[in-house]
């Protein structure tokens, strides 16, 4: 559904967003997971969402950082393939991926929602709805 | 249908400020952002930032990033850009843009902003 | 930032000849890739996105390909409404729109 192809790239959006920041962010590492395995997308998703990415207190971009941090873990309305993904018992808990620095962290975030953008519109049998 | 109406010409003085709207009719205002999108005279399309229409979140070009402010009256349907500080290389043709799936499906019929002393 | 490079930036071609214009990423931009058509004193219109994917009510004589840094825009016969400028723009990164390339008749 062209709603949730637009939060995705929304989502991109936002991260690329912060990544400009990345030096203003916490520099803890965060599970950030990786090659996930067919029907755990939304599963992955949710646990990037989950993760305590946050602003170092430091500078003027604080406001601009945390707003954005807000906004990427907004939940949007749910298809039916995320509810039944986030209660499968198979889907790698969030604490068993590869924790990582703020930088991969984003970079694999986006190309999770790359990823699954992709496998939207190759399920698309037909040409654009709305673009 | 959807559409995207944008405000009239404006001519404005070296470091002043301009504000052009932009109202959307023909869809749910807050299910789409919107792009704002500029074309200086005979040159190409230059991309200045975008603004959730539902929370004002916005994120704008590096190169425009402290002279522009996009915003948005859910009231009325219109987003706003607003450039300040501006110069003659600010003269231009400044669209909206729908942010659609995955391009800008629809376009506002540009605003010619003139800056001249 | 991710550039992109337009070619070329004018051609001249008469009713019914095969079109090509081709843009060029800075880096890799996987498919993220979207063409629009601008006629003088108007708004652009899309045209293809992601690549390959033909926007509603677009005519079948335009195709789009290409992967990676280099794409391609093909109109497969020229029609006399088809004489414009054409701007090719990623969405890999933010947004950035290549140079544009003006389609004039012969």
């Known amino acids: 559904q062209d709603r949730h192809m637009i939060r995705m790239r929304q989502l991109i959006d936002i991260v690329d967003q912060l990544k400009n920041y990345v030096n203003d962010l916490d520099p803890e590492f965060l599970p950030a997971p990786e090659d996930v395995e067919t029907n755990c997308e939304w599963s992955a998703i949710s646990c990037f969402q989950k993760a305590q990415l946050k602003s170092a207190n430091t500078g003027n971009n604080e406001r601009i950082i945390n707003l954005s941090i807000k906004k990427l873990k907004r939940k949007s309305p749910s298809t039916g393939a995320e509810r039944r993904q986030k209660h499968r018992l198979t889907c790698p808990s969030c604490d068993s991926y590869e924790k990582k620095p703020p930088k991969e962290f984003l970079e694999r975030f986006k190309s999770l929602l790359q990823k699954m953008i992709h496998q939207h519109l190759s399920s698309r049998t037909h040409g654009s709805e709305d673009s | 249908q959807v559409q995207l109406v944008q405000s009239g010409a404006e001519v404005k003085k070296p470091g002043a400020s301009v504000k052009v709207s932009c109202k959307a009719s023909g869809y749910t205002f807050t299910d789409y952002w919107m792009h704002w999108v500029r074309q200086a005279p005979g040159q190409g399309l230059e991309w200045m930032g975008l603004?959730?229409?539902?929370?004002?979140?916005?994120i704008y070009n590096q190169k425009f990033k402290g002279r522009v402010t996009m915003t948005r009256d859910t009231s009325t349907s219109t987003v706003y850009m607003e450039l300040s500080s501006l110069r003659s290389e600010d003269t231009a043709v400044y669209y909206c843009?729908?942010?659609?799936?995955?391009?800008?499906?629809?376009w506002g019929q540009g605003t010619l902003v003139t800056v001249s002393s | 930032d991710i550039q992109m490079t337009q070619s070329p930036s004018s051609l001249s071609a008469s009713v019914g000849d095969r079109v090509t214009i081709t843009c060029r990423a800075s880096?890799?931009?996987?498919?993220?890739l979207n063409w629009y058509q601008q006629k003088p004193g108007k708004a652009p219109k899309l045209l293809i996105y992601?690549?390959?994917r033909l926007h509603s009510g677009v005519p079948s004589r335009f195709s789009g390909s290409g992967s990676g840094t280099d794409f391609t825009l093909t109109i497969s016969s020229l029609q006399p409404e088809d004489f414009a400028t054409y701007y090719c723009q990623q969405f890999h990164t933010l947004r950035t729109f290549g140079g544009g390339t003006k389609v004039e008749i012969k």
């Open positions: 992601y690549t390959s």
């Open positions: 603004i959730d229409t539902s929370e004002s979140y916005t």
């Open positions: 880096q890799d931009i996987s498919n993220y």
């Open positions: 843009a729908r942010y659609g799936p995955l391009a800008m499906d629809y």
